[in-house]
Interface confidence: medium
Amino acid sequence: KETAFVEVVLFESSPSGDYTTYTTGLTGRFSRAGATLSAEGEIVQMHPLGLCNNNDEEDLYEYGWVGVVKLEQPELDPKPCLTVLGKAKRAVQRGATAVIFDVSENPEAIDQLNQGSEDPLKRPVVYVKGADAIKLMNIVNKQKVARARIQHRPPRQPTEYFDM
């Protein structure tokens, strides 16, 4: 289970139409459910239940998008429509270049994601928890435009892509 280095960049637009960026670094783990490779894209927050419906009509995320899913406590969803792995697959089917799960409330999901799958996804499936998950969800919950860049080695220049 390799470390996933995640850079999250928040884009704030000013009244003049210019954009300012704020970069945050955090770490997670690549799960065995997906590939250990780099990915980047705009963050799209996905509710676990939102992955249940089969509606594939997504807005055009032309440059690729990264799905972020905050998993709930298992007691709140005793009969989930899909397993955690199924949710990851559904997000990738819809075009996600990667999926990041916040497993803080559902640590059992880590084992589910790391069960050796015969057919792992060709995109990264990363999980975060603790302080890193809090950092990530704080950004996602701002409802502003943000991009994530996932790497399997530490970024040499942390703000290379995004420092404007």
Epitope: E40, E42, D59, L60, E62, Y63, V145, R147
Partner: antibody, heavy 121, light 108 residues
Amino acid sequence: EVQLVQSGAEVKKPGASVKVSCKASGYTFTSYAMHWVRQAPGQRLEWMGWINAGNGNTKYSQTFQGRVTITRDTSASTAYMELSSLRSEDTAVYYCARDLMVRGGPPFDYWGQGTLVTVSS
Amino acid sequence: EIVLTQSPGTLSLSPGERATLSCRASQSVSSSYLAWYQQKPGQAPRLLIYGASSRATGIPDRFSGSGSGTDFTLTISRLEPEDFAVYYCQQYGSSPRTFGQGTKVEIK
């Protein structure tokens, strides 16, 4: 100051290829996508494709698929557009334009000055 | 692909007058991803409006955009001498990105 500076005018024979460059300065090259758009004399603008300057991913218009190749050199902050199997209808001004790569953000907010490519036997 | 049709083809007006340019899409433009550009002879296009109604950096407030779905409008409240040019609409909500054929605003 943001600037996109393109290479000079080219005259090519039918069947040949042309490679136009677009050098970016004044911003972080890898934070943006670079698009290529062309305009034939007296015609509307026509989108050709883009490259994500950060990771090199590309997307091309079906109209040019197989004939156009967009690349970039991050160390030189330069994007390139190569068009092959040129025909007279490819005579046009070719522009590069940058895009912030976020939904809701401004598309094509800065453009190169344009490169005239003339295809003539 | 989404086809954009602009009208009128040419608009003959005097400085100080109001200009209203129309852009109609063959199908709904996703999330109002519609932009307007100004182009003068021998120059590259310049972004005026994006997201149907947001002014780009440095664009004077006499330029405004409105509309959603398939019908969009660019309004220039009081034409200045430097506003006489060709205006293009562009949709960037679905691939391929497409442009209208342009509206020329000329001095009457």
